[in-house]
């Protein structure tokens, strides 16, 4: 950008240095160079000389006009052609920015991931603003009326130790940039209602050769929450549609879930849980792949997700790696 250059004059922008994207703008350049009556004034945008829409206003001043300016950032400077000077003389420069005021933040969500020690608040910021936009998260105790504010550029982690005003809070988000300010609706929360259990993980799968072969999925969570509801979704990798099974779960031991699947098909599994009756779900777990055998049972490892075949009666899939899951609709 253009900063700390030695100016011999002035450059300014109308209506402003930061403006709404798509506006018409004028950039003015006024030379104040000793012993120079400029023959010509030139404008440069990002180092490239502008050829059109330049108007000479008087002996020392010129205007560059842009219609429908759509660039988020540009470095402008102007120069003068002075008599008896071989090179153009720099007058001054300025960085300009265009963008949008923030949208009203919506879908404000606060959750406490078990064992994290934090309340994590997120929101939908709306359309891209292109300019520096800050968010102030307000947390107000409904019991003590005390309000705390947290400044951030995206989401916020608030230590649960700092939430000393009881269990019930109002949370809202203010968005602000140089072009405007908006405020979300208030979200009312109870700390006990927003806890998301420790992540559920699928550890392995095996297909047992029975009269009708069945696949057993082994999965677990480190949660200390007693009443947990879970969903496991699965599908053939060639399919678009997920099948979903629901479970009421007690994680005092590793869970085993049985599925009767088509032979010689590669399946993918994911699991997620919530505290029973509460609002927020975990994100879906990492994708877990398992290929069912043709006739001989199969064991595959998640660490080796290329289709590995072992001899023997049972072949299982074992989870050791992490793969990216489809986390759309993570919380809710």
């Amino acid at each position: 950008g253009i900063t700390n250059i030695n100016c011999s004059g002035h450059i300014w922008v109308e209506p402003a240095t930061i403006f709404k994207m798509g506006m018409n703008i004028s950039i003015y350049c006024q030379a104040a160079i000793k012993n120079c009556q400029p023959r010509k004034l030139h404008f440069y945008k990002n180092g490239i000389k502008e050829r059109f829409q330049i108007t000479r206003i008087n002996k020392t001043t010129a205007r560059l006009w842009y219609k429908n300016f759509l660039e988020p950032h540009a470095s402008m400077y102007c120069t003068a052609e002075c008599p008896k000077h071989f090179q153009e003389t720099l007058i001054c420069g300025k960085d300009i920015s265009s963008g949008y005021p923030p949208d009203i933040p919506d879908e404000v969500t606060c959750v406490i991931y078990e064992y994290s020690g934090n309340m994590t608040c997120t929101w939908n910021a709306g359309k891209l603003t292109y300019i520096d936009t800050k968010y102030v998260v307000h947390v107000k105790s409904l019991e003590t009326e005390e309000e705390q504010q947290y400044l951030t550029s995206s989401y916020i982690n608030i230590s649960t130790d700092s939430l000393q005003g009881g269990k019930k809070y109002l949370v809202w988000v203010q968005a602000a940039n140089a072009l405007g300010m908006e405020e979300s609706k208030q979200l009312q929360i109870h700390l006990d209602d927003i806890v998301i259990p420790s992540a559920a993980v699928i550890s392995r799968a095996e297909t047992i050769n029975a009269t009708v072969p069945k696949t057993i999925i082994y999965w677990d969570s480190q949660t200390t929450i007693e009443k947990v509801s879970c969903e496991m979704r699965y599908k053939a990798t060639t399919n678009q549609t997920w099948n979903v099974k629901e479970f009421d779960t007690n994680f005092t031991y590793v869970q085993q879930s049985e599925f009767y699947l088509e032979p010689n098909i590669k399946y993918v599994f994911q699991v997620r849980c919530q505290e029973t009756g509460k609002r927020y779900w975990q994100p879906w777990s990492s994708l877990f792949f398992h290929k069912t055998p043709e006739t001989v049972p199969q064991v595959t490892s998640k660490a080796f997700q290329h289709d590995t075949w072992n001899s023997g009666l049972t072949v299982a899939s074992i989870s050791t790696g992490h793969l990216t899951s489809d986390n759309r609709g993570d919380i809710g």
Partner: nanobody, 121 residues
């Protein structure tokens, strides 16, 4: 509505100093770059110096090394320290705001009423 009030002008001998102030009031939502201009009798208004919101400064060649522009954000005031004054610095000095951002509340440019500086030889 922004009001700009210049002060600090007066009469001074050549080689002397003056400090002009431009106090801005009345704006809550808008941020501005601030510029000093001057106009001598029978002449056009000319640029003297400017300071951006980030503190970067610019000067006319005729005042470089003699004048210094500064700002006090807490007081919403811009200063022009004028040293080694010359008779050709005699003029009415005006300050002007240039808005940094166009927001939903309209931010316009504003001019002050001016303060007279007279330098005698």
């Amino acid at each position: 509505q922004v009001q700009l009030q210049e002060s600090g002008g007066g009469s001074v001998q050549a080689g002397g100093s003056l400090r002009l102030s431009c106090a801005a009031s009345g704006y809550t939502y808008c941020s501005y770059d601030m510029t000093w201009y001057r106009q001598a009798p029978g002449k056009k208004r000319e640029f003297v110096s400017a300071i951006d919101s980030d503190g970067s400064t610019s000067y006319a060649d005729s005042v470089k090394g003699r004048f210094t522009i500064s700002q006090d954000n807490a007081k919403n005031t811009v200063y022009l320290q004028m040293n080694s004054l010359k008779p050709e610095d005699t003029a009415m000095y005006y300050c002007k705001t240039d808005p940094i951002a166009t927001i939903s509340r309209r931010c316009d440019s504003y001019w002050g009423q001016g303060t007279q500086v007279t330098v005698s030889s």
